[in-house]
């Protein structure tokens, strides 16, 4: 509550997160023309990345383009990308939607379609839908431990969200355990009124707000965090503005003296930890 | 404008960026003693890194040290690093400028120069100038989509920079389209009075400021962002303070049971998105 | 000092860090059943990661699990994880502490102990103590250059911590050189009353606070930073809340047609640069 006689000071904050959980992923894998069932275990080193500060990312879905090499190949036949003759292809042209530079030739993509030949990482990435349901949908059961150290330098006051009395096997609950700082990812989504299974397909951004409203006067001292959750990406976003949350990264390797890469389009949830509040003192 | 009767509250912000574009890179490549022209295509997975939050990085130039292995070798003959006898070399000494630990021996670096032998990743990195013009100078034509979600918790108000009415094929322009949140990198530099081609060589830091001055009173509601741009690194910086923006990273691999690495010194532009402003309400 | 007649404005800040130093690491390496002394040099590309913004990380210790592959194996015999018959193992169960999914069988881990068989990255990570002393304990002598650009947009005022008059071979000292922005990591710890050698074993988080108290009135202009240091992680933290600072990451590769990984549990110091302060003007 606003105490007008107090000197208010904004919070200086540092955050440390630790995600726990393993996911079982089953998908069809094609090798040497034969498709069979692939099954793998993903642990933290596989689905999250060493990130700093107020964000962490959990991969919930992916599309792989394996064995790409720098060469010439037909571009992917997106809508409007097909051609019937070389006239449609402009040498040196880089279409922002495409992944390469046109050579000026129109070549067969498959038995029925032709597209412009490009210099690119080939074969070019297929613009296929993200798998549904999401491959790491079980990430809903992962947990994250959030450690938050705060400081009001003007009041020379420091505290943290984890107290010595806390139990390391707790799970946050709005009513039963609102001070526990171990959160089940699915619960975060439920609290925000969102469906984890749905968001996991395309990815998204979830805000974890930590609000410190601190009264630092000795006679009525109070300084504990309040957690709330809200979705930060726009679920109704137009396709042209790239809905969801994904990024591409590559693993490079050499085979027969040729540099190759596996391109991974990783979809997932980026969690932003937004710490705010004030410390007031007479 | 300052409305003194209003209760002001600082903005809580979350940012999501998406870079688009491909670059054609032509450089001299030496293999087995033979130098030939190399040509390659760089896409987002090659020139940017999965980064969180209010920053993104676009690599515009690089220097590679390929096939380094942990062994003994002469250090690079920087200014003041040459020797004529073992007396000049101190066993166990780590020169902060050097990349290894001296063995105490003075050995030939090439036909004309001798330097102290070091235990290091060898051959040690040559301290050569960044290529000029920059290898990925065409990054000037890349675009970045910036999504910004803001929140005034005290006023329980949330909005974002991208509205449903916006057109996903727009490009930001200060006069013609000041609300479009797709920015051409070259335009950002032009707006800041900087030369992209020049900065791309050594790298730099560019600030994209998003200012929200929000009047949340229902009778005169206004809450839209204003974008401005300014260079954040010091272009006149003394050599000793490391001008520009670069970092080194490595790709590790095994060959003949020996661990090797390719060291990449990546120069580029780090874009910092600085969101600030207040929400005022009666 | 508080000048009540002034219009105060919070600082907008951008930070750029550059770490320098090499570490000599000696450790026991086991290959083909034979243990021998390994010696290697770590430079910035080996012990730090390309990170953005207000944080940088220096690896001071690590534990490697080499040559892991996705298969079946006995889980690590942590406290309470041993079994004597299949009844103790539940098919499909994922113990949050474990790194895999149980098959339902109890199998020998070694000559004396049996644990539940799991589908996981195998052999599963041994839960051994971080090496003591820390492998990169010499990181105490690394230095970091911190560049900080600040802006008070309302006052249209910009400055930075590095002035043209500064000497690039200085080292920060609270008394003798309080404006130098090159910091020895060991000195930062000493200033904060912490023992680098000790913290390096398990890792930790160290805050570098940069306080700008700026009087922008022309007749009594003052705007220089003040640096202070404090530890941000809780050194007295209960085991269940994961003391110290570490994360796991993996290097993937293919051998004998099987995807393998080396898992690295990296312990280290995350340095958070916390910039705060106000600019006041009549």
């Amino acid at each position: 509550s606003d105490k007008l006689y107090q000197r208010k000071e904004p919070v200086i904050s540092s955050v440390h997160t630790k995600v726990k959980g393993i996911a079982e992923v089953t998908e069809n894998v094609t090798e040497g023309g034969v498709t069979k069932l692939g099954h793998s275990i993903f642990d933290t080193a596989d689905y999250t990345f060493p990130l700093q500060g107020n964000s962490f990312f959990v991969m919930t879905n992916y599309v792989k383009s394996e064995g790409q090499v720098q060469t010439l190949c037909p571009e992917y036949p997106r809508r409007g990308a097909q051609c019937s003759s070389d006239r449609r292809c402009k040498k040196g042209w880089m279409d922002p939607q495409s992944k390469g530079i046109q050579t000026g030739r129109c070549v067969p993509y498959d038995k029925t379609r032709k597209t412009c030949e490009v210099s690119a990482w080939c074969p070019t990435e297929e613009e296929k839908e993200a798998p549904r349901p999401a491959l790491l949908r079980s990430a809903e059961n992962f947990t994250v431990l959030i450690k938050n150290n705060i400081h009001f330098p003007g009041h020379n006051y420091t505290t943290r969200n984890i107290l010595p009395t806390m139990n390391g096997s707790c799970t946050f609950h709005k009513t039963w355990d609102p001070q526990c700082s171990i959160f089940r990812l699915g619960d975060i989504f439920q609290e925000a009124g969102e469906n984890f299974t749905e968001v996991a397909v395309q990815g998204g951004i979830m805000g974890i707000e930590i609000y410190w409203d601190c009264n630092l006067d000795s006679w009525s001292h109070h300084c504990r965090p309040r957690y709330s959750f809200r979705r930060l990406d726009d679920k109704n976003m137009d396709e042209s503005f790239v809905p969801g949350y994904n990024f591409r990264y590559a693993k490079y390797y050499k085979e027969n003296n040729v540099e190759k890469r596996t391109l991974i389009k990783a979809f997932g949830i980026r969690f932003d930890i937004l710490v705010f509040g004030t410390g007031g003192k007479f | 404008s300052d409305k003194l009767y209003q209760r002001k509250e600082p903005v809580i912000s979350s940012v999501h960026t998406k870079v688009k574009g491909i670059a054609e890179v032509t450089e001299n490549v030496t293999e087995g003693g033979v130098t030939k022209l190399g040509h390659s295509i760089f896409d987002t997975a090659d020139y940017t890194f999965p980064l969180q939050g209010n920053s993104f990085f676009v690599m515009t130039n690089y220097v590679k040290s390929e096939g380094q292995v942990q062994t003994l070798c002469p250090e690079y003959p920087r200014r003041g690093a040459q020797c004529s006898s073992d007396r000049r070399c101190k066993k166990g000494w780590m020169d902060p400028q050097s990349k290894g630990i001296q063995t105490g021996r003075c050995v030939p670096y090439d036909k004309t120069r001798k330097t102290c032998e070091v235990s290091a990743w060898c051959p040690t990195e040559e301290e050569k100038e960044a290529p000029r013009p920059a290898l990925l100078r065409s990054a000037e034509n890349f675009t970045v989509l910036i999504k910004n979600n803001i929140h005034f918790p005290g006023h329980n108000y949330t909005t974002r920079n991208i509205l449903p009415t916006m057109n996903g094929s727009c490009t930001f322009h200060k006069t013609w389209d000041p609300q479009c949140s797709i920015f051409r990198l070259g335009d950002i530099f032009q707006e800041a009075g900087e030369n992209f081609t020049e900065v791309a060589v050594q790298g730099g830091i560019m600030g994209i400021e998003i200012y929200w001055d929000c009047n949340l009173d229902s009778w005169s509601h206004h809450c839209r962002p204003r974008y401005s741009f300014r260079r954040l690194d010091d272009k006149n910086m003394d050599e000793s303070f490391v001008p520009g923006y670069n970092f080194r990273y490595a790709k590790y691999y095994k060959e003949n049971n020996v661990e090797k690495r390719t060291l990449i010194k990546a120069f580029g532009i780090r874009f910092d998105i600085l969101v600030f402003g207040t929400g005022g309400k009666f | 000092s508080d000048k009540l007649y002034q219009r105060k404005e919070p600082v907008i800040s951008s930070v750029h860090t550059k770490v320098k130093g090499i570490a000599e690491v000696t450790e026991n390496v086991t290959e083909g059943g034979v243990t021998k002394l390994g010696h290697s040099i770590f430079d910035t590309a080996d012990y730090t990661f390309p990170l953005q913004g207000n944080s940088f990380f220096v690896m001071t210790n690590y534990v490697k699990s080499e040559g892991q592959v996705q298969t079946l194996c006995p889980e690590y015999p942590r406290r309470g994880a041993q079994c004597s018959s299949d009844r103790r193992c539940k098919k499909g169960w994922m113990d949050p502490q474990s790194k895999g999914i149980q098959t339902g069988r109890c199998v020998p881990y070694d000559k004396t102990r049996k644990t539940c068989e799991v589908s996981a990255w195998c052999p599963t990570e041994e839960e051994k103590e971080a090496p003591r002393p820390a492998l990169l304990r010499s990181a105490e002598n690394f230095t970091v250059l911190i560049k900080n650009n600040i802006h008070f947009p309302g006052h249209n005022y910009t400055t930075r911590n590095i002035l043209p008059t500064m000497n690039g071979s200085c080292t920060f000292h609270k008394t003798w050189d309080p404006q130098c922005s090159i910091f020895r990591l060991g000195d930062i710890f000493q200033e904060a009353g912490e023992n680098f050698t000790e913290v390096a074993v398990q890792g930790g988080i160290m805050g570098i606070e940069i306080y700008w108290d700026c009087n922008l009135d022309s007749w009594s202009h003052h705007c220089r930073p003040r640096y202070s240091f404090r530890r941000l992680d809780d050194k007295n933290m209960d085991e269940s809340f994961v003391p110290g600072y570490n994360f796991r990451y993996a290097k993937y590769y293919k051998e004998n047609n099987v995807e393998k990984r080396t898992l690295i549990k990296a312990f280290g110091i995350r340095f958070d640069i916390l910039v705060f302060g106000t600019g006041g003007k009549f």
């Epitope: 079982e24 089953t26 069979k36 069932l37 099954h39 | - | 040559g67 892991q68 592959v69 996705q70 298969t71 079946l72 194996c73 098919k91 499909g92 999914i101 098959t103 339902g104 069988r105 068989e117 589908s119 195998c122 052999p123 051998e255 004998n256 099987v258 393998k260």
Partner: nanobody, 120 residues
Framework: EVQLVESGGGLVQAGGSLRLSCAAS????????MAWYRQAPGKQRELVAD???????NYADTVNGRFTISRDNVRNTVYLQMNSLKPEDTAAYYC??????????????WGQGTQVTVSS
């Protein structure tokens, strides 16, 4: 039906060499640990060597330094290269594999055995 088929056994003089092979065939998800065991007349079956899917090997003390186990993950085959053979290596050699028919459905499979005889 999953099968393990061994080959390469035979008669050899002391100090000689042999190479055993064992291939897994049939419909399955994954071959995990593979191994060779042996059983001499009137004795219990004993482990000779095993190899994980990640190529980690383990040998009985009696064969360490003389025998080498290896595998080919494309062909789902395990090999045992036996050098400096001794008369006490004479036995029936059995191939073993821990194979997942489906996800988390592992079973232990054995080959029919192949005879190795070392004459002095």
């Amino acid at each position: 039906e999953v099968q393990l088929v061994e080959s390469g056994g035979g008669l050899v003089q002391a100090g000689g060499s042999l190479r055993l092979s064992c291939a897994a065939s049939g419909n399955f998800f994954r071959v995990n640990t593979m191994a060779w065991y042996r059983q001499a007349p009137g004795k219990q079956r004993e482990l000779v060597a095993d190899i994980t899917r990640g190529d980690r090997t383990n040998y009985a003390d009696t064969v360490n330094g003389r025998f080498t186990i290896s595998r080919d993950n494309v062909r789902n085959t395990v090999y045992l290269q036996m050098n400096s053979l001794k008369p006490e290596d004479t036995a029936a050699y059995y191939c073993y594999a821990r194979i997942e028919l489906g996800v988390l459905e592992p079973r232990d499979y054995w080959g029919q055995g192949t005879q190795v005889t070392v004459s002095s």
